[in-house]
């Protein structure tokens, strides 16, 4: 009978190995190792047995020894088993970014490594063990999914094997593929709200805010704002899982009409978008024409209204009859019209939104000179030595100059107050004189004497 | 002056309808005009309006379901295809008016008509 | 649009009390704000419009006030006929999509 010693071994790919082989006889007729691995015999040996050293062992092995002894031939195996960690040990790429609330499938591929029966493919979040399995095939995949948080943003994910030798080898071997960093992120089925107004003049500024809630993460998402062709440059402020976009707009002639409003809020690979109808008006202020804007008391006046051709105008308050862009009445020029205002105001609807505008203009009318009794009395009866102030108005546009003189040369003190003295007292030429000429009127001031008893 | 609707009627699901509102006293080219209805236990609802020209918009809500035209005197809401949901009264109001004070001219349902039933049942 | 927002939902005031509505609208409509009052079976009546003028024939118990975006309406010496549901409407646009009346206010009279 032959004996093998060790009956089995376990050795590193590459690695040595000595085995003895021994007859059951004392003086075996012959003693040897069959095997196609590299083998030195270790001399001396013994009558009955031989040791060799077999070197460079690259796979699993079974050396054989065999022994012819009188009583028969026989033989013996040695189980050499080779062990080598994975040459590859790697994680599958992740997807750029990954929703939250939706499966993520891990998968890591193990290329090598023996004795696959000892090796375990563990898939990691961090330190924490996801699925342990057995490594099958060459090369080996091992998958798992896993559902996905807003916790697993920025965490860390690998694949580790385990090569487990023990009791035989009692070290545990590890190999750990690079870590790949898993980007999550969360756009909620809702569309972005947009405030914005609904019309718009030409020239003039609006704003426009878009925002939207539950992010994640808010600071990843990218805004897009737009009016037609136009890119619009928001403000963008972050709450906590909330952002807010806000613009302001300046729309031209050549943009009026009906625009697109877009809203794009853009995280991971998803986008949410809204689009609003956004009407762009051009409304000038009505024109209020006067055929003159002065004019002499008497004079036919023509007051015109006119706006933009979709408006409806109200002249002072009366409206267009029919109601229209275009209002005008005919008024005789009086005293009383001279600095009056005419408005003209005009109202226009865009895409059902009002819009108002307005114009004033001023008519100015030319009248007098003018000196009334009302206002400049022909006759005035004072006690002598009372305290009196001479009144005498005159009227007129432009405003008239007024002197009153007695004898061509003594000054009636109009609006001041005077003494009444025996000097005051006779007739008055008063004279009011402007562009437009002069109208004169007789004063005349009548002084009473005290009674002394 | 006065509007007033017609056309109200027990209709089956699906087969459109078309009520008319009748103004009398004043011009329709002069003023814009708004159906409004009020569905059983529920609040005035706008439905549309259409404009001294001719123009329409419509609530959100009424968009495609209904249409709103004019003629001369009168003016026209058909209900495209109606459900059940579409059983109301059924209003028609002038809507326009002025402030002398401001020269402005504004929406305001100044004049109404009685009312239409409408009534969409299997 | 112009959202309106019409508080309270419903309201029970005695005879002879003093019931207080209010209308929000969501953006300014300076003073184009008519108040409706509308009882089952008859067309809505106009109440006040221009947010304050009094509209011909109604009762000076009724007051409206505001402008911009907060509008009230006030009810002052309540009798037994104005039990009825009130409406708030925005008089500034009719634009696509446009909410043009408040929710409604019902007034219950004890």
């Known amino acids: 009978q032959t004996s093998v010693f060790p009956p089995e071994v376990i050795l590193p790919r590459g690695g040595s190995v000595k085995v003895n082989c021994s007859a059951s006889c004392d003086q075996p007729i012959s003693l040897g190792m069959e095997t196609p691995l590299p083998k030195k015999e270790i001399l001396p040996g013994g009558n009955n047995w031989k040791m060799y050293e077999l070197s460079n062992v690259q796979e699993d092995s079974q050396p054989m020894c065999y022994s012819n002894c009188p009583d028969g031939q026989s033989s013996a195996k040695t189980l050499l088993t080779v062990y080598w960690t994975p040459e590859r040990v790697e994680l599958a790429p992740l997807p750029p970014w990954q929703p939250v609330g939706k499966n993520l499938t891990l998968r890591c591929q193990v290329e090598g490594g023996a004795p696959r029966a000892n090796l375990t493919v563990m898939l990691l979040r961090g330190e924490k063990e996801l699925s342990r399995q057995s490594a099958v095939g060459e090369p080996a995949e091992v998958t798992t999914t896993v559902p996905v948080g807003r916790d697993d943003h920025g965490a860390n994910f690998s694949c580790r094997t385990e090569l487990d030798l023990r009791p035989y080898v009692l070290k545990l071997f590890e190999n750990t593929s690079a870590p790949h960093q898993l980007q999550t992120f969360d756009l909620p089925a809702t569309p972005p709200q947009l405030v914005s107004p609904q019309v718009l003049e030409v020239d003039t500024q609006g704003t426009v805010v878009c925002s939207l809630d539950g992010l994640f993460p808010v600071s990843e998402a990218q805004v897009s704002l737009a009016l037609g062709d136009q890119k619009l440059n928001p403000t963008i402020t972050y709450g906590n899982n909330s952002l807010s976009a806000k613009a302001s707009v300046k729309v031209t002639a050549e943009e009026e009409g009906t625009q697109q409003l877009l809203c794009g809020v853009m995280l991971g690979n998803q986008t949410q978008e809204t689009r609003q109808t956004v009407t762009i008006y051009s409304f000038p202020a009505p024109n209020v024409n006067l055929t003159k804007p002065e004019v002499s008391e008497g004079t036919e006046v023509i007051v015109e209204c006119e706006a933009h051709p979709r408006a409806k105008v109200m002249l002072n308050g009366v409206p267009a009859q029919p109601p229209g862009p275009r209002a005008q009445f005919l008024l005789k020029a009086t005293p009383e019209d001279n600095g009056r205002s005419f408005s003209c105001s005009a109202t226009l609807e865009v895409a059902g939104q009002l819009v108002h505008k307005n114009q004033t203009r001023e008519l100015r009318v030319l009248y007098g000179p003018r000196l009334d009794e009302k206002d400049c009395p022909g006759n005035w009866t004072w006690p002598e030595n009372s305290q009196q102030t001479p009144m005498c108005q005159a009227w007129g546009n432009p405003l008239p100059q007024l002197k009153c003189l007695k004898d061509g040369t003594f000054p009636l003190p109009i609006g001041q107050s005077v003494t009444v003295t025996r000097d005051l007292e006779g007739t008055y030429l008063c004279q009011a004189r402007s562009t437009r000429g002069e109208v004169t009127r007789e004063v005349t001031v009548n002084v009473l004497s005290p009674r002394y008893e | 002056q006065s509007v007033e609707e017609s056309g109200g009627r027990l209709v089956t699901p699906g087969t459109p309808l078309t009520l008319t509102c009748t103004a009398s006293?004043?011009?329709?080219?002069?003023?814009?005009m708004s159906w409004v209805r009020q569905a059983p236990g529920k609040g005035l609802e706008w439905i549309g309006i259409?404009?001294?020209?001719?123009t329409t918009y419509y609530a959100s809500w009424a968009k495609g379901r209904f249409t709103i035209s004019k003629t001369s005197t009168t003016v026209d809401l058909k209900i495209t295809s109606p459900t059940t949901e579409d059983t109301a009264t059924y209003f028609c109001?002038?809507?326009?008016?002025?402030?002398?004070?401001?020269?402005?001219?504004?929406?305001?349902?100044?004049?109404w008509g009685p009312g239409t039933l409408v009534t969409v049942s299997a | 649009g112009y959202d309106m927002t019409q508080t309270p939902a419903s309201v029970e005031v005695a005879v002879g009390g003093t019931v207080t509505i209010k209308c929000q609208a969501s953006?300014?409509?300076?003073?184009?704000l008519v108040w409706f009052q509308h009882k089952p079976g008859q067309p809505p009546k106009r109440l006040i419009y221009?947010?304050?003028t009094l509209a011909s024939g109604v009762s000076s118990r009724f007051k409206g006030s505001g402008s911009g975006t907060h509008f009230t309406l006030t009810i002052s010496g309540v009798e037994s006929a104005d039990a009825a549901t009130y409406y708030c409407?925005?008089?500034?646009?009719?634009?696509?999509?446009?909410?043009?009346f408040g929710g409604g206010t019902e007034v219950v009279v004890k």
């Open positions: 409407q925005q008089g500034y646009s009719r634009s696509d999509g446009e909410h043009v």
């Open positions: 006293g004043f011009s329709l080219s002069n003023y814009y």
């Open positions: 221009k947010a304050s």
């Open positions: 953006q300014s409509i300076n003073s184009w």
């Open positions: 259409i404009s001294d020209s001719g």
């Open positions: 109001a002038r809507d326009w008016s002025y402030d002398s004070s401001s020269g402005y001219y504004y929406y305001d349902m100044d004049l």
